[in-house]
């Protein structure tokens, strides 16, 4: 009997079991009893990533300068190209399709995770005890000052967007 | 024991026909692939024509496409190759095969044509 | 077509040399290639096939290799049953081609 099913890397046509095409290359025809089947490398600027009946091979991802995008990696016959974003900037998206400057943490915030090639800033409010009072996607929060280690006294009380202000202790006369 | 006898070769003027046959045994004929090899005296082997099994497809050199046919009839275990306008290009022993894994396993004998005026 | 192209086109040897036949295919055929071998009068006979695979009841003194588009047939020490003529045979396009052939001779 012809068979139903067929082994791994193979795939059923016209009751038959023909070999699939290598990654990195198309199908150009099925096989037959008498021939195996005929595959043609992926062109340049295209790939194919998996064994495969494909009659087209895909074309390699535009990693889009205008969209803030770069080449990571170079794609291959086998192997699509990825893209990431250029210094300062972050994928929006799990494939990388456009990228977004890093948020930076406002006065009164510091920054908790730094930005990466595919995550945005991670901020976080200044606890009591720390300070922010600059716009940044890399300052993190600030002990406020220790007016003791100094000698000297709080004049004015720290916030989370403003340092304490440290003066003279007040001498007894 | 697989057996594989070719019939039906002779001289034949050019332009007419020849019907060869081959008649097989000590296998499930229908479960092959099938075909005819030909090779002109003193020269090598030319592939003329394969006809799959489970009355597949059918398959043919270029130099004999349009004018050769290939067939089978499993219920008689026969294999056929229809020879119109025959050239004297196409002088040759006519040997059939039994494929498998894309290789010829077993052949047979051979029968010769020949055309001449 | 895909041309097939066997060197040499004869040779000569002796009982217990070790003979090397090459095959070269005018495109890339992966391993789909096969030996066939032809006695004078006989039907030929196959000996290798996928470039490597040794047909069952053939001596283990014929070996294939090769991949792509260059291929070798070797006899490890030839035997006076061994002196036929050899094709190389290409099943990676349709239509299948053969080889023209390498006719081995005692020397």
């Known amino acids: 009997e012809p068979p139903t099913a067929c082994r791994e890397k193979q795939y059923l046509i016209n009751s038959q079991c023909c070999s699939l095409c290598q990654p990195g290359q198309k199908l150009v025809s099925d096989c037959t009893e008498f021939t195996e089947t005929e595959c043609l490398p992926c062109g340049e600027s295209e790939f194919l990533d998996t064994w495969n009946r494909e009659t087209h091979c895909h074309q390699h991802k535009y990693c889009d300068p205008n969209l803030g995008l770069r080449v990571q990696q170079k794609g291959t016959s086998e192997t699509d190209t990825i893209c990431t974003c250029k210094e300062g900037q972050h994928c929006t998206s799990k494939d990388c399709e456009a990228c977004a400057q890093h948020t930076p943490c406002i006065p009164g915030f510091g920054v908790m995770e730094m930005a990466t090639e595919t995550t945005d800033t991670v901020c976080h409010p200044c606890p009591v005890g720390f300070f922010s009072n600059v716009s940044s996607a890399f300052e993190k929060c600030h002990p406020w000052t220790s007016c003791e280690t100094k000698d000297l006294v709080v004049q004015q009380a720290g916030t989370n967007k403003t340092d304490v202000v440290c003066g003279p202790q007040d001498r007894l006369r | 024991e697989v057996q594989l006898l070719e019939s039906g070769g002779g001289l034949v003027q050019p332009g007419g026909s020849l019907r060869l046959s081959c008649a097989a045994s000590g296998f499930t004929f229908s479960s092959y692939a099938m075909s005819w090899v030909r090779q002109a005296p003193g020269k090598g082997l030319e592939w003329v024509s394969g006809?799959?099994?489970?009355?597949?497809?059918?398959y043919y050199a270029d130099s004999v496409k349009g004018r050769f046919t290939i067939s089978r009839d499993n219920s008689k275990n026969t294999l056929y190759l229809q020879m119109n306008s025959l050239r004297a290009e196409d002088t040759a022993v006519y040997y059939c095969?039994?494929?498998?894994?894309?290789?010829?396993?077993?052949w047979g004998q051979g029968t010769l044509v020949t055309v001449s005026s | 077509d895909i041309q097939m192209t066997q060197s040499p086109s004869s040779l000569s040897a002796s009982v217990g040399d070790r003979v090397t036949i090459t095959c070269r295919a005018s495109q890339s055929i992966s391993s789909y290639l096969n030996w066939y071998q032809q006695k004078p009068g006989k039907a030929p006979k196959l000996l290798i096939y996928?470039?490597?695979s040794l047909q069952s009841g053939v001596p283990s003194r014929f070996s294939g290799s090769g991949s792509g588009t260059d291929f070798t047939l070797t006899i490890s020490s030839l035997q006076p049953e061994d002196f036929a003529t050899y094709y190389c045979q290409q099943y990676g396009r349709n239509p299948p081609t053969f080889g023209q052939g390498t006719k081995l001779e005692i020397k």
């Open positions: 996928a470039a490597s």
């Open positions: 006809i799959g099994s489970y009355g597949g497809g059918t």
């Open positions: 095969a039994r494929y498998v894994n894309f290789g010829m396993d077993y």
